[in-house]
């Protein structure tokens, strides 16, 4: 089948990383610089994606294979093949339209991107709060009141500072 | 809020060159991850890209244009330039400068546009 | 260069009507494109990003859909405001806009 499949298009015989070059009477041309062919048989190479600006190369393009791109520091990729960069924040901070913005008392963020989530309710679980939770990190929930010795007392969270959904400025 | 302002715009004799300006405000031009392009309209028809210079200051020009085209800034003024030489006719148009990008996610289109400057070439 | 070709070049269409422009890559450019809307005498105003992300402050009548080569601009009831010119842009490559197209008033 191969063999009358190529008598039949002799494009069928192009492998990866050239094209079947009609100006040459459909010889196997090498792609072009900046451009691949990831499959054979092809009439024209791709030009490679270029990795300018806010995103910087990850993965340099080939005869055979595109290039792949990430973001510089500072930013993470978004969307298919990192086709956007969004801005990093620093833990305990979520990304708003207006840019950075510091969790609200009650909830927390662990990493550069992402929203801040509410600390964890331990009491729903008939749970303690052990260890209160920051802006950066989760409450860590102990044993529940009844399970503790007697004498023992569990943390109680501080008052808030400020009206609970204010940001600090 | 972002702003961008082109100025330098007008006659020019066929064969002359252009200098044009475009002040940045409201954003720094060396910011990482910033990058402002030129783009023109002639008039009655589309757009066309002319180049782009990013904050690490690597540019990137059309190829139909490359050889006549120089994009600079200058960090201090927060000031971007597009030179053009060797004009002709067909180059007369609005000149527009716009940053690459939206607010927090940035990528390769272009979100804030300036009002655009006419250059006419004409003898 | 990768060529973008917009169909069609104009439509004439009615206030509350459904259009779609249509915008096809010379080949694969994955999400990268983004679609402004411009109107006589102003400068383009983004509307799309990354093929569907609407921009901010842009009704949510217009929305955007494709990945590859085929992509589609879509304005779901047509308002007064939105009789313009609509380009679309790739930025896979260097950077290249469509040629228009111009939604008119029936």
């Known amino acids: 089948f191969e063999r009358t499949r190529s008598l039949q298009d002799p494009c069928s015989n192009c492998p990866a990383g050239t094209f079947c070059d009609n100006n040459r009477n459909q010889i196997c041309s090498p792609c072009p610089p900046n451009s691949f062919s990831s499959a054979g048989g092809q009439r024209t190479c791709d030009i490679c994606r270029q990795c300018k600006g806010v995103f910087r190369t990850r993965k340099e393009c080939s005869s055979t294979s595109n290039a792949e791109c990430d973001c510089t520091p500072g930013f993470h990729c978004l969307g298919a093949g990192c086709s956007m960069c969004e801005q990093d924040c620093k833990q305990g901070q979520e990304l708003t339209k207006k840019g950075c913005k510091d969790c609200c008392f009650g909830t927390f963020n662990d990493q550069k991107r992402g929203i801040c989530r509410p600390w964890t309710n331990c009491s729903l679980d008939g749970k303690s709060v052990l260890v209160n939770g920051t802006k950066e990190r989760d409450v860590v929930c102990g044993p529940s009141p009844a399970d503790l010795s007697p004498g023992a007392s569990s943390v109680t969270p501080p008052a808030p500072a400020r009206e609970p959904g204010h940001s600090p400025q | 809020e972002v702003q961008l302002v082109e100025s330098g715009g007008g006659l020019v004799q066929p064969g002359g060159s252009l200098r044009l300006s475009c002040a940045a405000s409201?954003?720094?031009?060396?910011?990482?991850?910033?990058?402002v392009g030129w783009i023109r309209q002639a008039p009655g028809k589309g757009l066309e890209w002319i180049g782009e210079i990013y904050h690490s200051g690597s540019t990137y020009y059309s190829p139909s244009l490359k050889s006549r085209v120089t994009i600079s800034r200058d960090n201090s003024k927060n000031t971007l330039y597009l030179q053009l030489n060797s004009l002709k006719a067909e180059d007369t148009a609005v000149y527009y400068c716009a940053r690459e990008g939206s607010d927090v996610v940035t990528g390769d289109w272009f979100a804030y546009w300036g009002q655009g400057t006419l250059v006419t070439v004409s003898s | 260069d990768i060529q973008l070709t917009q169909s069609p070049s104009s439509l004439s269409a009615s206030v509350g009507d459904r259009v779609t422009i249509t915008c096809r890559a010379s080949q694969g450019i994955s999400s990268v494109l983004a679609w402004y809307q411009q109107k006589p005498g102003k400068a383009p105003k983004l509307l799309i990003y990354?093929?569907?992300s609407l921009e901010s402050g842009v009704p949510s009548r217009f929305s955007g859909s494709g990945s590859g080569t085929d992509f589609t601009l879509t304005i779901s009831s047509l308002q007064p405001e939105d009789f313009a010119t609509y380009y679309c842009q790739q930025g896979y490559s260097l950077w290249t806009f469509g040629q228009g197209t111009k939604v008119e008033i029936k």
């Open positions: 990354d093929a569907s």
């Open positions: 409201g954003f720094s031009l060396s910011t990482s991850g910033v990058g």
